[in-house]
């Protein structure tokens, strides 16, 4: 059974992941730029199911495409450095799901925009944090 300290660590990591995803979404929502329209044409794969930490495998597999889309947004008004940001998210995801996982991600048939993708993973983090609180 998970100890209280391991639960606390998991909760903190999930909170960090949640904040990072919220920061990206906020940056995109604040973005007044023709590039935004182009960003929204990129399609992301969504998990068929995302209810457990092992399902973060699905997020991990989409981090490279996410970085590529965020690279489009570089400007003086977009304050997220994609490489640092994705690297930070990747570290958190690996710690949360465990690097030895053999879980194979199953994706939904429908793809999503970056906004829908981020909202899905934000909801995932929030729901798991709620069960830990």
């Amino acid at each position: 059974a998970p100890t209280s300290s391991s639960t606390k660590k998991t909760q903190l990591q999930l909170e960090h992941l949640l904040l990072d995803l919220q920061m990206i979404l906020n940056g995109i929502n604040n973005y007044k730029n023709p590039k935004l329209t182009r960003m929204l044409t990129f399609k992301f794969y969504m998990p068929k199911k995302a209810t457990e930490l092992k399902h973060l495998q699905c997020l991990e597999e989409e981090l490279k495409p996410l970085e590529e889309v965020l690279n489009l947004a570089q400007s003086k008004n977009f304050h997220l450095r994609p490489r640092d940001l994705i690297s930070n998210i990747n570290v958190i995801v690996l710690e949360l799901k465990g690097s030895e996982t053999t879980f194979m991600c199953e994706y939904a048939d429908e793809t999503a925009t970056i906004v829908e993708f981020l909202n899905r993973w934000i909801t995932f983090c929030q729901s798991i944090i709620s069960t830990l609180t």
Partner: antibody
């Protein structure tokens, strides 16, 4: 003990910039993301933005975008909030808060000609 | 942005009274709501997080409830040190937003 200590009060002229510091102690600096909140005299609380202290990236409220810059110095466990093109409406107490649980004492910034 | 509306904006009460403050979000925020107490010249102090969890060291006379869009902060028996301004705050989505505050004054 866990605490955030902010720099002292500032008086600035319209059009100038102000840089407020917030030094963390008593905990691992990179453990909690840092928010900045301001409060105009007799008014409510207003969120300005957030900084990830480990990686240094930021996200700002739309209202402040283009005027605010948040930075950090991990060697001194300090975060900074710089607000430029000051106007009288920016007169407020500026707070840093670590994970919403710990708050700095506040820094009064007065903008007056 | 999510708007947070508190009511009442001020209230007068006596020591020992039961006080209730409500907060309404413009859209569902699940239980991503916190309550703060602020005294003049001081920084806000976290009382309740996740809508109903009491922060460490906060007296048990404070309680929070609600989920979705409607939330309540209750002080079961008002003490002299409880006269202050109270704010609700949502952290469900950025930008983080606060209610306009409720000032609890001595009757």
């Amino acid at each position: 003990q866990v605490q955030l200590v902010q720099s002292g009060a500032e008086v600035k002229k319209p059009g100038a910039s102000v840089k407020v510091s917030c030094k963390a102690s008593g905990y691992t600096f990179t453990r909690y993301y840092m928010h900045w909140v301001r409060q105009a005299p007799g008014q409510g609380l207003e969120w300005m933005g957030i900084i990830n202290p480990r990686a240094g990236y930021t996200s700002y409220a739309l209202k402040f975008q283009g005027r605010v810059t948040m930075t950090r110095d991990t060697s001194t466990s300090t975060v900074y909030m710089e607000l430029s093109s000051l106007r009288s409406e920016d007169t407020a107490v500026y707070y840093c808060t670590s994970g919403w649980e710990v708050w700095g004492q506040g820094t009064l910034v007065t903008v007056s000609s | 942005d999510i708007q947070m509306t508190q009511s009442p904006s001020s209230l007068s009460a006596s020591v020992g009274d039961r006080v209730t403050i409500t907060c309404r979000a413009s859209q569902s925020i699940s239980t991503w709501l916190a309550w703060y107490q602020q005294k003049p010249g001081k920084a806000p102090k976290l009382l309740i997080y996740a809508a109903s969890s009491l922060d460490e060291g906060v007296p048990s006379r404070f309680s929070g409830s609600g989920s979705g869009t409607d939330f309540t902060l209750t002080i079961s028996s008002l003490q002299p040190e409880d006269f202050a301004t109270y704010y609700c705050q949502q952290s469900y989505s950025f930008p983080v937003t606060f209610g306009q505050g409720t000032k609890v004054e001595i009757k």
